[in-house]
């Protein structure tokens, strides 16, 4: 938690941010909360980015004030105007770009005082894996596919029955560049699959970790996937 101390007689207010990650091409949220004020017209929100001359976004007197907004953020930012009064200064960032990564400052002025907090924003690509069974003449393989990752992740297979086993010798992973030439499709194939077992395909980079599980029996196949963003730290 970072508390900004007051200058020239004004009190400080507590501003809290959470480090987060944006998925390239999708919309992202830069989280920031502050001690609320009773009057919307007394609240000023400024978002700044280290190394960028113009503002990322400014909200004051109950509306956006974008005259000093930097070109790289033009038309891509918005605050949740109806939630500002309750202390939500989070910024919605549309169509996240790789270059949006960096250190952001959420700077707040209210009638109670002012405060700020920094936020580390990472950008990349991450997606849910899907694990399917492929059939050969008399054996099965598992195919784990995830459409969009960046930077290039690691892929590790695990199994419930053979806990701690290393499947690198019986698996093959490939990365195929997508059409926008940044993100990549991840495909990993696991050979020598045995029935009555649950396998996990774990894909991880420095931004996210995703797991696709598949339970394989004679009579059914059950799948489950989940994705977790890494390094979500509060400041």
């Amino acid at each position: 938690l970072i508390i900004g101390f007051g200058i020239s007689g004004r009190h400080s207010i507590t501003v809290t941010t959470v480090a987060s990650a944006g998925n390239i091409g999708e919309d992202g949220i830069l989280s920031c909360t502050f001690e609320p004020d009773i009057k919307l017209s007394d609240i000023v929100i400024q978002w700044l980015k280290e190394g960028v001359l113009g503002l990322v976004h400014e909200f004051k007197e109950g509306k956006d004030e974008l005259s000093e907004q930097d070109e790289m953020f033009r038309g891509r930012t918005a605050v949740f105007a109806d939630q500002v009064i309750v202390g939500n200064a989070s910024l919605r960032l549309k169509n996240v770009q790789l270059t949006d990564a960096g250190t952001y400052k959420c700077y707040i002025i209210t009638s109670k005082g002012k405060g700020n907090a920094n936020l580390e924003y990472k950008t990349g690509a991450f997606s849910m894996p899907e694990v399917n069974v492929d059939y050969n003449a008399s054996s099965e393989t598992l195919r784990c596919e995830a459409p969009r990752w960046f930077p290039q992740p690691t892929v590790v297979w695990a199994s419930q029955v053979d806990q701690g086993a290393n499947f690198s010798e019986v698996s093959n992973t490939s990365f195929e560049l997508n059409s926008e030439n940044v993100t990549m499709k991840v495909v990993s194939v696991l050979y020598n699959v045995t029935i009555n077992n649950t396998y996990s395909c774990m894909i991880e980079n420095d931004i996210a970790k995703a797991t696709g599980d598949i339970k394989v029996t004679e009579s059914e196949i059950k799948r489950r996937s989940h994705l977790q963003l890494l390094n979500s730290k509060a400041s």
């Epitope: 399917n132 069974v133 059939y135 699959v193 029935i195 394989v216 009579s219 059914e220 196949i221 799948r223």
Partner: antibody, heavy 117, light 106 residues
């Protein structure tokens, strides 16, 4: 090469029973289940039942009272028996290999059954 | 039981055409759907499993798609040897089949 070969009678009288043997090659019944499916012009393809690799069975609820499936792993044979046959049991009966997740992949050549007096 | 409905009983086509056969499940079956081809006097032959994955040796002109309740089998550049009956089947529970679609020449 995976093969399922069926043998059984072509004509059975009403109220009698049907017995079909499915002899498999190219895979072991210790590792694969075998389904039974029938096909008739009136009802299309109908799943009848399955014997799993471990020997347990599942049956279509419509046939559970008159159907039994068993196997002899050492002879690579699966046995199908259906009792109390009626004219509407006239169909082609197939044995089919099971794959992981209940997928039916390799089919026998079929046994054509006519139930008639 | 889950009912698989193939509304097209017969589809007429010409060699080289593209044809799409549809199948609807009475409830959500995820992608646990297979497609079979059956020629007269022969046993059904597995073409597609998991709704969209081609089985071993199946030509790439056969494509499956769909999930949930709506599924399609598309045959691109139809060949004379493709004239047959096509059945969809769900195997998320005890298997049930569609009534079939016969592909014939115009």
């Amino acid at each position: 090469q995976v093969q399922l070969k069926q043998s059984g009678p072509g004509l059975v009288q009403p109220s009698q029973s049907l017995s079909i043997t499915c002899t498999v090659s190219g895979f072991s019944l210790a590792n694969f289940g075998v389904h039974w499916v029938r096909q008739s012009p009136g009802k299309g393809l109908e799943w009848l039942g399955v014997i799993w690799s471990g020997g347990s069975t599942d049956y279509n609820a419509l046939f559970i009272s008159r159907l039994s499936i068993s196997k002899d792993i050492s002879k690579s044979q699966v046995f199908f028996k259906m009792n109390s046959l009626q004219a509407d049991d006239t169909a082609i009966y197939y044995c089919v290999r099971n794959r992981v997740g209940r997928l039916l992949d390799s089919w026998g050549q079929g046994t054509t059954l006519t139930v008639s007096s | 039981d889950i009912v698989m409905t193939q509304s097209q009983k017969v589809m007429s086509t010409t060699v080289g055409d593209r044809v799409t056969i549809t199948c609807k499940a009475s409830q959500n079956v995820d992608t646990v759907v297979a497609w079979y081809q059956q020629k007269p006097g022969q046993s059904p032959k597995l073409l597609i499993h998991s709704a969209s994955r081609r089985y071993i040796g199946v030509p790439d002109r056969f494509t499956g798609s769909g999930s949930g309740t709506d599924f399609t089998l598309t045959i691109n550049n139809v060949q004379s040897e493709d004239l047959a009956d096509y059945f969809c089947q769900q195997y998320s529970t005890n298997p049930t089949f569609g009534a079939g679609t016969m592909l014939e020449l115009k």
